[in-house]
Interface confidence: medium
């Protein structure tokens, strides 16, 4: 029951996480204009991975997509790639985990198969979450670097004179959505991996069984039948696989007259 709950919760958490990663990737507000000490407050700029927008105090908003690939910074391309890989892996993971859910029966799928699928989806969720966190963190680092460079430029400017305008960009809402979503996907993946351990059937060890005499008075009859002694009620010479049966590991054999030829 606990395993089913862990698996189900892991699936739901990952589902929310991946939905968040998709939302973050599509959002326009990855970076927003820092309006502190900005002389032109009538205009607000914000950028996403796919387009940039301008919003004015009058309500006028205009967005334009990045129609060029060559002119874009390599870091932006890398972030796009990381987010897309995260989404693809997450989507595949979700698909796999649906079939792996213990509460869903598909044909005569064995628990071992479900366990393997759960582990696979768990690993996919973990990698997906890490991709999203990495992508958002790379972008955030890019912003922080540019922000402080811009701040330096504001006070030095061209040829040592004060530069009157310098646009600085800071963290947009998408970054926070991405971080949280990546974290949730990661947690969901870990939960799936934990659930996998509970789903995996116990290994059946078919150990070699040796039949040893319980006492010195016990004789073996041909045909593998245990001789009737005062210890058991096997009067009809039925084949016995329990009682005196012990594995090689469990019993220490004592020498008897039958052990040597």
């Amino acid at each position: 029951m606990a395993v089913t709950a862990c698996q189900g919760l892991g699936f739901v958490v990952s589902l929310i996480g991946i939905a968040g990663i998709i939302a973050a990737t599509c959002m326009d507000q990855w970076s927003t204009q820092d309006l502190y000490n900005n002389p032109v407050t009538a205009v607000f700029n914000y950028q996403g991975l796919w387009r940039s927008c301008v919003r004015e105090s009058s309500g006028f908003t205009e967005c334009r997509g990045y129609f060029t690939l060559l002119g874009l910074p390599a870091m932006l391309q890398a972030v796009r790639a990381l987010m897309i890989v995260g989404i693809v892996l997450g989507a595949i993971g979700l698909l796999v985990s649906i079939f792996a859910l213990k509460c869903i029966r598909i044909g005569s799928m064995e628990d071992s198969a479900k366990a393997n699928m759960t582990l696979t989806s768990g690993i996919m969720f973990i990698v997906s979450g890490l991709c999203a966190i990495a992508g958002v963190s790379v972008f955030a680092n890019m912003l922080v670097t540019n922000f402080w460079m811009s701040t330096a430029n504001m006070y030095t400017g061209m040829g040592g004179m004060v530069q009157t305008v310098q646009t600085r960009y800071t963290f947009g809402a998408a970054l926070f959505v991405g971080w949280v979503a990546g974290g949730l996907t990661l947690i969901g993946g870990v939960m799936m991996c934990i659930a996998c351990r509970g789903l995996a059937p116990e290994e059946t060890n078919y150990k070699a069984v040796s039949y040893h005499a319980s006492g010195h008075s016990v004789a073996y009859k041909p045909g593998g039948f245990k001789a009737s002694t005062g210890f058991g009620s096997n009067t009809k010479n039925k084949k016995i696989y329990d009682g005196g049966a012990r594995t090689e590991d469990e019993v220490q054999s004592y020498p008897s007259k039958h052990d040597y030829v």
Epitope: S31, V40, Q47, V54, E56, E62, R64, F67, N146
Partner: nanobody, 118 residues
Framework: DVQLVESGGGLVQAGGSLTLSCAAS????????MGWYRQAPGKQRELVAD???????NYADAVKARATISRDNAKNTMYLQMNNVKPEDTAVYYC????????????WGRGTQVTVSS
């Protein structure tokens, strides 16, 4: 690389008018704000006027009644018309553009000299 090219500067008689134009070297740029700044000898650079994509304008008090700023978003060009120019308008006029796409940044032109003779 992006270049902003100013034109229209020169020697102007006091009381006369002048029109400055600024053009971006690429027409595919998404410029949110374009503006004119000026720097008189020994003084700091100051805003003359700026204009947003939506046409919202902002003027310095010194030129408010005498200047008109306009832009063509499709061509990424901007114009500044100044009437009744005064000797104190003598300065190097710089074009400024705040680019949002395909990369972000603030760009300046090399400047054009405007001299008002009395």
């Amino acid at each position: 690389d992006v270049q902003l090219v100013e034109s229209g500067g020169g020697l102007v008689q006091a009381g006369g008018s002048l029109t400055l134009s600024c053009a971006a070297s690429r027409s595919d740029l998404f410029i949110s704000i374009m503006g004119w700044y000026r720097q008189a000898p020994g003084k700091q650079r100051e805003l003359v006027a700026d204009i947003s994509r939506g046409g919202k304008t902002n003027y310095a008090d010194a030129v408010k009644a005498r200047a008109t700023i306009s832009r063509d978003n499709a061509k990424n060009t901007m114009y500044l018309q100044m009437n009744n120019v005064k000797p104190e308008d003598t300065a190097v006029y710089y074009c400024y553009a705040q680019i949002s796409n395909p990369f972000w940044g603030d760009y300046w032109g090399r400047g054009t000299q405007v001299t008002v003779s009395s």
